[in-house]
């Protein structure tokens, strides 16, 4: 699984070496005599068989279709066929960012706590034998490190370590120089010891509604990664087909905490939805916090002081 291209949808950056490796490779070695074919289709083009003659950038090995390099016009569907085995990939080649040493779409980010040990290592197992040298860049400035085969950073984090780290592998193929880039975004935060989770906004919310209309009740909280946020309403949750809990959305704060929101959607509001409590709770090992929403008919608004209304 770690050695073949298992994903059916792949996005790559133009100008880099790239390969597709089918997942029945061990099988292919057993049946050397079997005809093995690679095809491409894109747009109006039907299956076109690929071979080194079809492009000087393409190389075919036992299990692998290599691109030297992959270009925008390589976007399309690729097929490997051998006897009754077929594997298909959809390849999307995106533009390189000409103004940076990396393309934002290809970045993976991690949070590191200040003073904690962290590391960056530059490795590429597939092209390992072809790599002449590897450089590590921070925010597109080359770092001077001893090892130019597998440059590594291992240290206790300081705030100045925050940034984009790009491993650039330089390799030769058929007399040409290529490079492959992998970029990591490191964010340094204060230590992430747990906070007491808190729901945002007033504890009691009267919401003015009209019968037959829909309403969305938004419950937001600041919480820890393992804390949960949920809605409680009525005798039995889920007994009203007009009430739907939407998928929880989470965004990480710069401090490594989470801002979560969960919407309760009430459709075709009826009398039974009025003047009852819809409770939103955030729960953690340190306790719970609850806020309540009450739906009030718009006509009855005059009976309630204005300051208790939410939009």
């Amino acid at each position: 699984a770690e050695s073949c291209t298992s994903r059916p949808h792949i996005t790559v950056v133009e100008g880099e070496p790239f390969y597709l490796k089918h997942c029945s490779c061990s099988l292919a070695h057993e049946i050397e005599t079997t005809t093995k074919s690679w095809y491409k289709s894109s747009g109006s083009q039907e299956h076109v068989e690929l071979n080194p003659r079809s492009s000087s950038r393409i190389a075919l090995h036992d299990c692998v279709l290599e691109f030297w390099p992959v270009e925008l016009n390589d976007t399309g569907s690729y097929f490997f066929q051998m006897k009754n085995y077929t594997q298909k990939w959809k390849l999307n080649v995106i533009r390189r960012n000409k103004h940076s040493c990396f393309t934002e779409r290809q970045v993976t980010s991690k949070i590191v706590e200040v003073k904690k040990f962290f590391q960056i290592t530059c490795e590429n197992s597939y092209y390992q034998t072809l790599v002449n040298s590897t450089s590590l860049y921070k925010n597109c400035k080359k770092l001077l490190l001893e090892n130019n085969k597998n440059p590594t950073i291992k240290k206790n984090a300081e705030f100045e370590d925050q940034g984009y780290y790009s491993c650039v592998h330089f390799l030769h193929h058929n007399g040409k120089l290529f490079n492959i880039t992998k970029t990591f975004n490191i964010t340094i935060v204060e230590d992430r010891s747990n906070i007491v989770p808190v729901l945002l906004g007033p504890k009691l919310n009267h919401v003015a509604v009209e019968l037959g209309k829909n309403v969305r009740l938004n419950c937001s909280a600041l919480l820890n990664e393992e804390d949960v946020i949920y809605w409680m309403f009525g005798e039995e949750n889920g007994s009203d087909p007009n009430i739907h809990e939407e998928k929880e959305m989470r965004i990480m704060t710069p401090e490594g905490k989470w801002h979560a929101s969960k919407v309760l959607r009430i459709e075709n509001i009826g009398e039974s939805n009025l003047n009852v409590l819809y409770n939103c709770t955030v729960a953690s090992t340190g306790g719970t916090d609850t806020k309540s929403f009450i739906l009030v008919r718009k006509a009855d608004m005059a009976d309630i002081p204005g300051h208790v209304f939410t939009r």
Epitope: E2, S3, R7, I10, Q119
Partner: nanobody
């Protein structure tokens, strides 16, 4: 851009269990195959387990087969590694990684990770 945070490591006795979590944010979690790497003190970076986004098919290194279980909850944008029957040789820093190719060939031991120590 996907952002990953590992947690759940700790000290456990041989034979014990731990569950590691990796919370993802900032991008569509289900666009990525997810996996766990580990690096023992002074050792090399080793791919432990992966799970694909399309059919949730899994891979396990021989050293953890039958003891570790990888899973993902796309609704919570979270990856898990349930580790049972832990051994001293499982002691390592464990790193979560997202892969948009499915080739797992570019080394995943980076960041802070979460330390798992198996000792009596």
């Amino acid at each position: 851009e996907v952002q990953l945070v590992e947690s759940g490591g700790g000290l456990v006795q041989p034979g014990g269990s731990l569950r590691l979590s990796c919370a993802a944010s900032g991008s569509t979690f289900d666009e990525y195959d997810m996996g766990w790497y580990r690096q023992a003190p002074g050792g090399k970076c080793e791919l432990v387990s992966t799970i694909s986004t399309i059919d949730a098919s899994t891979y396990y290194a021989d050293s953890v087969k039958g003891r570790f279980t990888i899973s993902r909850d796309n609704s919570k944008n979270t990856l898990y590694l349930q580790m049972n029957s832990l051994r001293a040789e499982d002691t390592a820093v464990y790193y979560c990684e997202a892969d948009d190719r499915g080739t797992w060939d570019r080394g995943g031991c980076w960041g802070q990770g979460t330390l798992v120590t198996v000792s009596s």
